[in-house]
């Protein structure tokens, strides 16, 4: 199955990165997983993963960084709290689970860059 | 000429890039010329340029909001007061001016990102 | 070299259990969620189990209620107790976590 995810993404000076990940479905899926992994340095990391019910809200755990909404198969993906360190790779795995057949696609990744911001001036 | 600069720098949250562009000499050139290319929506504008004598500093005009240095066939460039919407791809042109023959090289571009900063709160 | 085993697999008869494992090497279980899938001979793949990585787990409706997935972080490996085996159980079982599946084990429900 067919993931299809932006080459690159800049994170905003809030650290804050938005991206839409979009599957070209095969059937009529009513439960779908999206799942964001981070590679870098050849290692690949779970950042965050969600099921949800078509036409649903997407739920993140409560400490998940990130958010999402979806919109026919569309997901509109917004990862928050990153600093310099977590620019890397993020792949979006987008997972048909239920009816049968299960299929599984997989994104080329969206690389996304973060600059950390400079600190205010103290105020005096 | 083979000219290599790196595929993509970020800029600092200060709106500072930096990267190196090196040449493979084909001569023993004693002045050469460098100029900064930027190549934005298949529009491409000089950002800055400099001469310079082997084994001495580069020179951009006073108002230049580049800098650089050499050591050998590598230039070291620096621009600075870079904006969001400064974002583009930067093309070094390595020319040797003298002695003949003239040689000319272009590189591939560096993308350079630059994300704004947030303002900082007012200090009451 | 990230690395994803299964086993357990087997032949028993309707009503009968069997625990499947699957090991990991190369990175760690827990930070990831892990899914059990299964393929029927001559059918697509089917998903069984989910658990995250919160440790929350979910099933398919055609195992629940007979079906746990589970995993011991400190032997890095993850499990799927089947109880109340039906022939329609029967088919390779395979582990997937992040970008790994490992290569299957087989199960087959038969009198």
């Known amino acids: 199955m067919h993931v299809a995810q932006p080459a690159v993404v800049l994170a905003s000076s809030r650290g804050i990165a938005s991206f839409v990940c979009e599957y070209a479905s095969p059937g009529k899926a009513t439960e779908v997983r999206v799942t964001v992994l981070r590679q870098a340095d050849s290692q690949v990391t779970e950042v965050c993963a969600a099921t949800y019910m078509m036409g649903n809200e997407l739920t993140f755990l409560d400490d998940s960084i990130c958010t999402g909404t979806s919109s026919g198969n569309q997901v509109n993906l917004t990862i928050q709290g990153l600093r310099a360190m977590d620019t890397g790779l993020y792949i979006c795995k987008v997972e048909l689970m239920y009816p049968p057949p299960y299929y599984l696609g997989i994104g080329n990744g969206t690389q996304i860059y973060v600059i950390d911001p400079e600190p205010c001036p103290d105020s005096d | 000429m083979h000219v290599a600069q790196p595929a993509v720098v970020l800029a600092s949250s200060r709106g500072i890039a930096s990267f190196v562009c090196e040449y493979a000499s084909p001569g023993k050139a004693t002045e050469v010329r460098v100029t900064v290319l930027r190549q934005a929506d298949s529009q491409v504008t000089e950002v800055c340029a400099a001469t310079y004598m082997m084994g001495n500093e580069l020179t951009f005009l006073d108002d230049s909001i580049c800098t650089g240095t050499s050591s050998g066939n590598q230039v070291n460039l620096t621009i600075q007061g870079l904006r969001a919407m400064d974002t583009g791809l930067y093309i070094c042109k390595v020319e040797l001016m003298y002695p003949p023959p003239y040689y000319l090289g272009i590189g591939n571009g560096t993308q350079i990102y630059v994300i704004d900063p947030e303002p900082c709160p007012d200090s009451d | 070299q990230v690395q994803l085993q299964e086993s357990g697999g087997g032949l028993v008869q309707p009503g009968g259990s069997l625990r499947l494992s699957c090991a990991a090497s190369?990175?760690?279980?827990?930070?990831?969620?892990m899914t059990w899938l299964r393929q029927a001979p001559g059918k697509g793949l089917e998903w069984v189990s989910t658990?995250?990585?919160?440790?929350?787990?979910s099933y398919a409706d055609s195992v629940k209620g007979r079906f746990a997935i589970s995993r011991d972080n400190a032997k890095n490996t993850l499990y799927l107790q089947l109880n109340s085996l039906e022939i329609e159980d029967t088919g390779m079982y395979y582990c997937?976590?992040?970008?790994?599946r490992g290569q299957g084990t087989q199960v087959t429900v038969s009198s």
């Open positions: 190369g990175f760690t279980l827990s930070s990831y969620s």
């Open positions: 997937q976590g992040g970008l790994t």
């Open positions: 658990i995250n990585s919160g440790g929350s787990t």
